[in-house]
């Protein structure tokens, strides 16, 4: 079938980087500037992606492949093929529609993106809190209270973990 199709359809012979030009008796014409065709046999070339705003050009467009974008410092990629840029926050914060907001008490975020997550509840695993949590760091759980030598004290465990939420305004 493919052989028959190629005999009947001259467009199937047009390689990537060209298009089958109906205005010129189906001659294979090179893609115009700022356009590309990544597969053969195409009747049009696609417009190259433009990396505008905080999008930066990671890879230039060529006649056979689209441009690729990433995000300038202060923002990070979201979506397939970096279709969006989203702002970074500091560690100990999460992004809301009101901008970057500090994590509520009992929650933390150790990255520049994502939401604040509850501190680990050490007591659920029968352990004690070795190092208190902060806005930027989870608690560190230590041995269970029963494992501690007599007279040894541990830091008071945190309140039960809450759902991640935004700081009150």
């Amino acid at each position: 079938f493919e052989r028959t199709r190629s005999l009947q359809d001259p467009c199937s012979n047009c390689p990537a980087g060209t298009f089958c030009d109906n205005n010129r008796n189906q001659i294979c014409s090179p893609c115009p500037p700022n356009s590309f065709s990544s597969a053969g046999g195409q009747r049009t070339c696609d417009i190259c992606r433009q990396c505008k705003g905080v999008f930066r050009t990671r890879k230039e467009c060529s006649s056979t492949s689209n441009a690729e974008c990433d995000c300038t410092p202060g923002f990070h990629c979201l979506g397939a093929g970096c279709s969006m840029c989203e702002q970074d926050c500091k560690q100990g914060q999460e992004l809301t529609k009101k901008g970057c907001k500090d994590c509520c008490f009992g929650t933390f975020n150790d990255q520049k993106r994502g939401i604040c997550r509850p501190w680990t509840n050490c007591s659920l695993d029968g352990k004690s809190v070795l190092v208190n949590g902060t806005k930027e760091r989870d608690v560190v759980c230590g041995p269970s209270p029963a494992d501690l030598s007599p007279g040894a004290s541990s830091v008071t465990p945190p309140a039960p973990a809450r759902e991640p939420g935004h700081s009150p305004q």
Epitope: V54, M84, E86, K97
Partner: nanobody
Framework: EVQLVESGGGLVQPGGSLSLSCAAS????????MNWVRQAPGKEAEWVAN????????YYVDSVKGRFTISRDNAKNSLFLQMNSLRAEDTAVYYC????????????????WGQGTTVTVSS
Amino acid sequence: EVQLVESGGGLVQPGGSLSLSCAASGFTFRSFWMNWVRQAPGKEAEWVANINQDGSEKYYVDSVKGRFTISRDNAKNSLFLQMNSLRAEDTAVYYCARGGPDYGDLHYGMDVWGQGTTVTVSS
């Protein structure tokens, strides 16, 4: 073609005012959150302000609160940023950006950007 075009930038003295505009085309403007983002020379890009679809919600980065006002005119497919009491640290390229389709649902990505307009605050 989906497009955003900013205008209104220029040179202004400290304490002065400037109004930026952003003309949107190629999409249903009234259906999207819109944002202003700026990038100062040699610094990281910074979100400045956003506004929801009908203009009833507006939010600002702390450094511009009380000085900048974001607004929109859905009938004219336009976004605005009124900047008062300008400071040297407001010098930057200002970009208009469309909030992505799930903006506000734990995601705040911006998918369509203009080329930017330059604001210089200097005496």
